[in-house]
Amino acid sequence: EKAMVDGSWLDLAKRSKLEAQPFAHLTINATDIPSGSHKVSLSSWYHDRGWAKISNMTFSNGKLIVNQDGFYYLYANICFRHHETSGDLATEYLQLMVYVTKTSIKIPSSHTLMKGGSTKYWSGNSEFHFYSINVGGFFKLRSGEEISIEVSNPSLLDPDQDATYFGAFKVRDID
């Protein structure tokens, strides 16, 4: 009986620890995509609707803020698209990029953790163009550090929640 109580207590402890594990999955807010033809910061994301969720992390001023030290897996998926019904591309040669950036408040500094993308030739003869970028990596993050996303050509972003999103989850503590 004691073993059973110990076992269930262990399960509970494991479960509560898992529930406390920080994670976030943020999806693009399509009503507030910034304009620009160069690199811009994407600051408007959903954290509590559709597929978007957040726990033990904070989303503020367009940045995902780490609340617990640890090793985290960070990921971002960005889709670019253009359909001729919205008009023509002013240039057919495009640099479609995403940058995942870490900003530290304590020691004011900013680092690009991951970048991905390509230069593309989107011919005016085609009705539809699509390009997807996925980046992911394992990083040591400290409490108070902020993660943000920058992209090129935001007017071409695919605004669907299954297309443009980023997130993080804690994998383990820092020893």
Epitope: T85, D88, A90, N153, S155
Partner: antibody, heavy 126, light 103 residues
């Protein structure tokens, strides 16, 4: 205020060429595209082509491909449309129009014509 | 290639009347539709863009609605200065025009 001022009326013989100018003022010429649209007597408006005033990129209607040239002089904030091998059915009022999309804000030419020139009548007659 | 079809091709109405012009696209164009006013000897004027957004400086009696393939331009109370030909447009394609006259 934004203004597009076009050159005056022209009369040409069949087979000749015509070049119409469109001088822009009141905005940063290089940040927008200029479209050319025409209207023949009793006909609907007809899109001919555009030029991105910033980089000089152009796109034309299939109907005019090979006969039309659109250029721009950024120093003079002026766009030009030349139509060659004129025929009587090219008799029309030719308009330049500014695209609403600012190239600093994005890279899509949206085909919202927010400002128009006053039109240039081109008559092709033998 | 998308074809835009307007109806009616002409109409006659009294001052103060509500006037409706319809525009159909040969396939879905979402909300990428604009309306223009043309008066003889004058530069064309953008009235409505993106199906329902009123261009600045345009009187509020003009309104646009619709999405997909069917759109309407409404003049809530026709004024003498509204005598003109009205065109719908999606990117490179224009409708054939609707001539509005006063009875």
């Amino acid at each position: 205020q934004v203004q597009l001022v076009q050159s005056g009326a022209e009369v040409r013989k069949p087979g000749a060429s015509v070049k119409v100018s469109c001088k822009a003022s009141g905005y940063d010429f290089s940040n927008y595209a200029i479209h050319w649209v025409r209207q023949a007597p009793g006909q609907r408006l007809e899109w001919m082509g555009w030029i991105n005033a910033g980089n000089g990129n152009t796109k034309f209607s299939q109907k005019f491909q090979g006969r039309i040239t659109v250029t721009r002089d950024t120093a003079a904030s002026t766009a030009y449309m030349e139509l060659r091998s004129l025929r009587s059915e090219d008799t029309a009022v030719y308009y330049c129009a500014r695209d609403w999309s600012n190239m600093v804000r994005g890279i899509i030419i949206a085909y919202y014509f927010d400002y128009w020139g006053q039109g240039t009548l081109v008559t092709v007659s033998s | 290639e998308i074809v835009m079809t307007q109806s009616p091709s002409s109409l006659s109405a009294s001052v103060g009347d509500r006037v409706t012009i319809t525009c159909r696209a040969s396939q879905s164009i979402s909300r990428y539709l604009n309306w223009y006013q043309l008066k003889p000897g004058k530069a064309p004027r953008l009235l409505i863009y993106g199906a329902s957004s009123l261009q600045s400086g345009v009187p509020s009696r003009f309104s646009g609605s619709g999405s997909g393939a069917e759109f309407t331009l409404t003049i809530s109370s026709l004024q003498p200065e509204d005598i003109a030909t009205y065109y719908c447009q999606h990117t490179r394609a224009f409708g054939q025009g609707t001539k509005v006259e006063i009875k």
